[in-house]
Every structure is written in structure tokens, then in C-alpha cells.
């Protein structure tokens, strides 16, 4: 398919000018490429019209230009003095005519109105409102006022003084006539329909001697705003409908076949399901104005999409309208990752997110979606040192691997934390990704004690049992802070004895505290990583106590305190059932989503059948 | 529960200076931004300036851009509004609010986004 968009249709009136603007991938080649119009002819070819490299076709020759703006992506062609000869078939393209990097466009030109004389025109969009004067003589003050609509050769009555009104406009036209000093009435039609677009004729008496004013009332179907946007990227639809519906229901539809428009969210509390967990909208201004934000760009996300005000919240005739024609570029630069990730009760996530490396001085900042009335994303952290209260020393946001990708890691899952969470960054807006944690069944992988208290003054040992597949994983111990977890020095105790069916290659690795503090206490993760690359984690809190014997204390998975629902097992470990504990500190054992074979790699996307990617899983 | 008490307001004249205080008791760890509002008779409640609790970074209204300054001290868990060139349209009851649990897409500068409020001080300005 090819990359290029704009727009499918224009249409102008003879004697008018047209501004077409195309939108390209912004690549180095393309931003230098030759950018052309051309016509395309009955048997297949298309005849150069204006191109970047200054050629402009004698038909073009004064009224045409064709403006690149690389640093975009598009370019635009300005046509001037169209005529109908102008109606046809074009392309906007890159390259050579023929290689299809194009666009069709198709140009209608057509003769402007055939107006009597003394017309005022009134243009006005779709599904607003319009007011047609009507003047008249003092002796037609006390007489009949009336508004017909030409229908073809014949007026008919739309509305009258005496109260008439014609079926086509009840609920939406009244007749307003000024007071006795003015010598004018009106007649207001609100909530605009194509088919009232035409010829009117205001009239007041009804003999030879009545007044009349001819109208042309032209209702304008808003053109679409074109929109071109990566894939996997971010879009953003700006709805200023005017404080006139500012308190009428709003909604986001997209056009399916002919004339239908599905509804994707409105603020009644719909939303389609294919936008589950990538849709906001987020609260509208007192005038009336909102957005819609989607992230996780699919292909199937492109078409024509309308916003607009009605009190069924959704698309009906006369509903003031805006659009968008949103093309999705295939061809994109943010870089795939995993759209799902999964953990078990009492294990952790490390989620992987893209950003615009040109922007790595940008604040990052994760968001768990809600999906309740118009959706919205309160934030859990940040990487200026912000994390939600009740997820400290649980979350860290670290700028690691760094160059367009940073990580979050969140332990102690619980079935609560399954949902859609949302990557953005203060920078560049269409970087916005969303990832799904799912949680899973299965053990986490680490295993470390529960709560642990350590006595002021003494030393304290917390163990940390690594299973073999974590052989040739970076094994750490750190202490979590709310800018990250600083890296502790830790020691190799040797093979554990943890795990059955797991041979030398486990490790046991253990965290020493010397002279024990009060500035001690706290969340300890233990974790594997593969350079810059984050896999499972454990969390221990460590809580400090006044001394009552001396010695040091070694603690071991049996001797922490047994929270409840856990069952201290003969061999020394405690094993949590998979239940969700309300206080984080009483999480004993750990266990990440994927495979931190995936996380740690380079590629770390493993792709499942359907369309959504997913991050590890070998626990199934 | 956060407690906020506003401070510093009173009676000055065109041209001076007032500096508020903002103390919060029982502040969370984990505020995300201060913000101060202020409110004339009569009118709505107007955005002032804000400032990130981490990072420090700072938002103002157009009307005070350049003559007021909103500045934190972490130690003594208090925000600061220093009111400079002051004008009788500045007039009014200003607030203090702290917001601990931010949207992705809120707007500070709206007094929606904000659970704790104070019970503001009276700024009078004479000309």
C-alpha cells in the first residue's frame, strides 16, 4: 500500500482556487525526492502537470504552484482560476509518475449557482443554524409573512405568520418578527440539513403589491481535516462544536459503508470495543470543545471519522459535525513492541516503552487507563521522582535502556493490577503506546522471604533463590526509592536448594545489611537483567527495630514472619496462595510475566497468531 | 488527611507586594503539584500558577506572568506565592490547592484536578 495521502475529493466552484496538500513519510530520501501533480489520462498514463523540480505544464502555466515542506512530510498544490475543464482525475506522488508512490485525488469543478438578482447568499455548515432576513414595505406591516423553498419549478410554503409550519423543518424553524420600529422579520432554521441547501423566497402580503426577497441558502459538508499518522503511533481529534451544544451529549463515530458513522466513544458512556483500553476523551471546556485521544494505531483505525453534539450521542441529521480523514502510515518509526504482557499473582512485569529518541530529556510517565464514563489515565509514575502512593516500592519508571525506550517495572502483582496502561512522555504526543498486563496463572520465578525486620545496629542477611534459567542473567539486589532502585552490593551464596528439578545453575545470592539504621528500612528488590535490560524482580520490606538480644540475623524463607494464607512448606519455603493480600508487605515470593528470556534480548517481542503482540510467557 | 492553610494576604496598595504561604499538615509523600487560585466577588474561581512537587517546574496565567512567582520548601513543607507589581484587579481570595492523584491528560491549570483546597486568604489591592 502506499504511504502517501491526501485528500480523495475536492470540490470548488469555477472561477475559485484549491489548496491540496500530500503527506509523505518523512524519510531523507523522500524529503528530497521530486514531488509531482499530474492527470491522469483514459488509457492509464498520467501527463506531469507541476513538479518540484520547477516543471509547470502550459495548462498550469500563472495559476499553479507546488510547494514542498520536508520538514512535515507534505507538500501542497495551489490551483487558481479553476474551470470545469479542470474536473478530472489527478495523482500527488514522489518518484516517477508511473512507480506508485501516489495518491488519487479527484477534482470536481462545477458552475457556480445561477443567482437572480437581489439574492443573498447564506453559507452555512452542516447542522448549524441560519437567520434569512426578510425586509417589507409599512404597508405589508399587518399582512402575511411567509418562507417558500423552490422545488424545482414549483415554491412551496416552508413556514408562515399564521402559524404553519412544513413537516420537512418542525422542531427547528420559527419566524421571528421584529418590533414595530423595524420593518423586517426573520425566519431562524437551526440544526442544518443538506437537503435544505436552495432557492428560498421570503414574501410579506400575498397580492401584487407584497414584498419579496430571494435567498440562497448553501449548507456546507465540513471537508475532513486530513490526519496522517504512524502506526502503532498516537492520534489526537481536537472537537471545537461552540458553546451553543456545549451541554448536548458529544461523540466520536467513524464511516463505515455509505452513510453510516459507528460510534467510537461518546459521553454517554459508549464505547466501541475495538477501543478498549486505547480510547480517551477527556473532559470537554465550557465552550463545548473536547478531544479524543487513540493510541496503538492499527491499520483498521484508518477512514473518516466526525465528532459532533447530539442528545443521543451519536450521528443524526442536522447534528453539527467536524472531520477527519486519519490515514495510518505503515511505514513507521515507532518501533514494535509488546502490546501484552503477563504476570502471576506475586510475581512482576518489566514493560518496555518507545519513545522519540530525539526527546530524551522529556519527562516519562506511565498511566493505568480506566475505562469508567469517558475513560481517563490517572498517572502512577513519573521520571521526575513522582510515584502514586499506593504503589511505592512497587513501581519504578527507569530511564534505562535509554536511546527511544525506557522500562517499568511493577512487582507484588495482583489480580487487581491486570488492565491497560498507557506509555507517554511531555514530548512528542503521537509516541503514546499502550500495553495490557494480563496475570496469569503460575509461581513467581525469585524467591525471597516476607517482611523481614532487622534489629539497629546488627547485620542482617536477606536471600534472594534465582532459578537456573536465570544462569546467565545479571542477578542484583537494590533499594527502591521514587526515582528508581539503587544498585547494592550483594553475594553469590552458591547453588540454592530451592527449587526441585533445577540443577547447579540456580543461585542463591544474598543481600547484607552491616550496622543496621533506621535509614535501613524500606523496599529491597532482588531482580535479573541482561545489560540494560530488565527482567523479573522481588520485593522485601525490610522494617528496623530497636535491638533486644545481640548477633546478627540471617534470614531465611522459613524464619520471616508467616503472612496470612501462606503455608511454611517442610523444605523451608513459604509458598502464598494466589490470593490478593491487601498490604504489599506481606508478599513473600515473586514472579515476573514473561520469560525473561524475551525481556532480556534484543528483540524481546515474541508475536502470538492473533494480532496482538506479546511479551513472554513461559510459565503458561 | 492533607490539611492546607493559606497565610501572607491583607491590604496593600497599586504597585506593592504581598508574598502568601501555603503550610500543608499531614502533606503526602506523594503530592504531584500546589497549585494557588484566586476567586473576585462575583466571578469564578481563575487559575493562578502551579508548581511540580518533583522537578519544580512551574506553570503561571497569562494576567501574573513576570510579577508573580510561585516557589516550594520542601523542608518545611510549604509553597510560596511572591506577589509583585500588584494590581487592584488582583483583588480577590486566593487559594491554595495540592493535587496527589494526577490524570495523564488533566490540566493543571483547571481547579477540577486538584481533592485538597485551603481556606483561602484575602488579597485587597488599592489603588
Known amino acids: 500500500k502506499s504511504p502517501i495521502f491526501g485528500p480523495e475529493e475536492v470540490n470548488s466552484v469555477e472561477g475559485n482556487s484549491v489548496s491540496i496538500t500530500c503527506y509523505y513519510p518523512p524519510t531523507s530520501v523522500n524529503r528530497h525526492t521530486r514531488k509531482y501533480w499530474c492527470r491522469q489520462g483514459a488509457r492509464g498514463g498520467c501527463i506531469t502537470l507541476i513538479s518540484s523540480e520547477g516543471y509547470v505544464s502550459s495548462k498550469y502555466a500563472g495559476r499553479a504552484n507546488l510547494t514542498n515542506f520536508p520538514e512535515n512530510g507534505t507538500f501542497v498544490v495551489n490551483i487558481a482560476q479553476l474551470s470545469q475543464d479542470d474536473s478530472g482525475r489527478y495523482k500527488c506522488g514522489l518518484g516517477i509518475n508511473s512507480r506508485g508512490l501516489s495518491f488519487d485525488v479527484s477534482l470536481e469543478v462545477s458552475q457556480g449557482p445561477g443567482l437572480l438578482n437581489d439574492t443573498k447568499v447564506y453559507t452555512v455548515d452542516l447542522g448549524r443554524t441560519v437567520t434569512i432576513n426578510c425586509p417589507f414595505k409599512t404597508e405589508n406591516a399587518q399582512k402575511r409573512k411567509s418562507l417558500y423553498k423552490q422545488i424545482g419549478l414549483y415554491p412551496v410554503l416552508v413556514i408562515d405568520s399564521s402559524g404553519y409550519v412544513n413537516p420537512n423543518y418542525t422542531g427547528r424553524i420559527r419566524l421571528d418578527i421584529q418590533g414595530t420600529g423595524q420593518l423586517l422579520f426573520s425566519v431562524v432554521i437551526n440544526q442544518l440539513r443538506l437537503s435544505d441547501a436552495g432557492q428560498y423566497l421570503c414574501q410579506a402580503g400575498d397580492d401584487s403589491n407584497s414584498n419579496k426577497k430571494n435567498a440562497d441558502l448553501q449548507v456546507l459538508k465540513p471537508e475532513p481535516e486530513l490526519v496522517y499518522e504512524d502506526l502503532r503511533g498516537s492520534v489526537t481529534f481536537h472537537c471545537a462544536l461552540g458553546p451553543e451544544v456545549a451541554n448536548v451529549a458529544k461523540f466520536l463515530c467513524r464511516q463505515s459503508s455509505g452513510e453510516n458513522c459507528d460510534v467510537v466513544v461518546n459521553t454517554l458512556g459508549k464505547r466501541a470495543p475495538a477501543f478498549e483500553g486505547r480510547i480517551l476523551l477527556n473532559p470537554q471546556d465550557k465552550d463545548g470543545s473536547f478531544s479524543v485521544v487513540i493510541t496503538g494505531l492499527r491499520k483498521e483505525d484508518a477512514g473518516r471519522y466526525l465528532c459532533g453534539a447530539h442528545s443521543d450521542g451519536q450521528l443524526q441529521e442536522g447534528s453539527p459535525i467536524q472531520a477527519w480523514q486519519l490515514f495510518v502510515n505503515e511505514e513507521s518509526t515507532i518501533p514494535r513492541s509488546p502490546t501484552v504482557v503477563k504476570g502471576v499473582a506475586g510475581g512482576s512485569v518489566a514493560v518496555l516503552c518507545p519513545y522519540n529518541r530525539k526527546e530524551s530529556k522529556s519527562i516519562k510517565y506511565w498511566c493505568l487507563w480506566e475505562g469508567a464514563q469517558n475513560g481517563r489515565c490517572p498517572l502512577l509514575v513519573d521520571s521526575e521522582g513522582w510515584v502514586k502512593a499506593q504503589y511505592e516500592g512497587r513501581l519504578s519508571l527507569l530511564e534505562e535502556p535509554g536511546n527511544g525506550t525506557f522500562t517499568v517495572i511493577l512487582n507484588q502483582l495482583t489480580s487487581r493490577d491486570a488492565g491497560f496502561y498507557w506509555c507517554l512522555t511531555n514530548g512528542d504526543t503521537l509516541w503514546r503506546t499502550t500495553v495490557e498486563i494480563k496475570i496469569i496463572e503460575g509461581e513467581p520465578n525469585l524467591k525471597v522471604p516476607g517482611n523481614v525486620t532487622a534489629v539497629l545496629g546488627e547485620t542482617l542477611k536477606v536471600p534472594c533463590h534465582f532459578p537456573c534459567k536465570f544462569s546467565s542473567y545479571e542477578k542484583y539486589w537494590c533499594k527502591w526509592n521514587n526515582t528508581g532502585c539503587q544498585a547494592l552490593p550483594s553475594q553469590d551464596e552458591g547453588p540454592s536448594k530451592a527449587f526441585v528439578n533445577c540443577d547447579e545453575n540456580s543461585r542463591l545470592v544474598s543481600l547484607t545489611l552491616n550496622l543496621v539504621t533506621r535509614a535501613d528500612e524500606g523496599w529491597y528488590w532482588c531482580g535479573v537483567k541482561q545489560g540494560h535490560f530488565y527482567g523479573e524482580t522481588a520485593a522485601v520490606y525490610v522494617a528496623v527495630e530497636e535491638r533486644k538480644a545481640a548477633g546478627s540475623r540471617d534470614v531465611s524463607l522459613a524464619k520471616a514472619d508467616a503472612a496470612p494464607d501462606e503455608k511454611v512448606l517442610d523444605s523451608g519455603f513459604r509458598e502464598i496462595e494466589n490470593k490478593a493480600i491487601q498490604d504489599p508487605r506481606l508478599f513473600a515470593e515473586e514472579k515476573a510475566v514473561a520469560d525473561t528470556r524475551d525481556q532480556a534480548d534484543g528483540s524481546r517481542a515474541s508475536v502470538d497468531s492473533g494480532s496482538s503482540e506479546e511479551q513472554g510467557g513461559s510459565s503458561r | 488527611q492533607v490539611q492546607l492553610v493559606e497565610s501572607g494576604g491583607g491590604l496593600v496598595q497599586a504597585g506593592g507586594s504581598l508574598r502568601l504561604s501555603c503550610a500543608a499538615n499531614?502533606?503526602?509523600?506523594?503530592?504531584?503539584?500546589v497549585g494557588w487560585f484566586r476567586q473576585a466577588p462575583g466571578k469564578e474561581r481563575e487559575f493562578v500558577a502551579h508548581?511540580?512537587?518533583?522537578?519544580?517546574?512551574?506553570a503561571y496565567a497569562d494576567s501574573v506572568k513576570g510579577r508573580f512567582t510561585i516557589s516550594r520548601d520542601d523542608a518545611k513543607n510549604t509553597v510560596y506565592l511572591q506577589m509583585d507589581s500588584l494590581k487592584p484587579e488582583d483583588t480577590a481570595v486566593y487559594y491554595c490547592?495540592?493535587?496527589?492523584?494526577?490524570?495523564?491528560?488533566?490540566?493543571?491549570?483547571?481547579?477540577?484536578?486538584?481533592?485538597?483546597w485551603g481556606q483561602g486568604t484575602q488579597v485587597t489591592v488599592s489603588s
Open positions: 490547592a495540592e493535587d496527589t492523584n494526577p490524570d495523564a491528560f488533566g490540566d493543571l491549570r483547571l481547579p477540577s484536578e486538584y481533592e485538597y
Open positions: 499531614g502533606r503526602a509523600a506523594n503530592a504531584y503539584a
Open positions: 508548581i511540580r512537587w518533583n522537578g519544580g517546574r512551574t
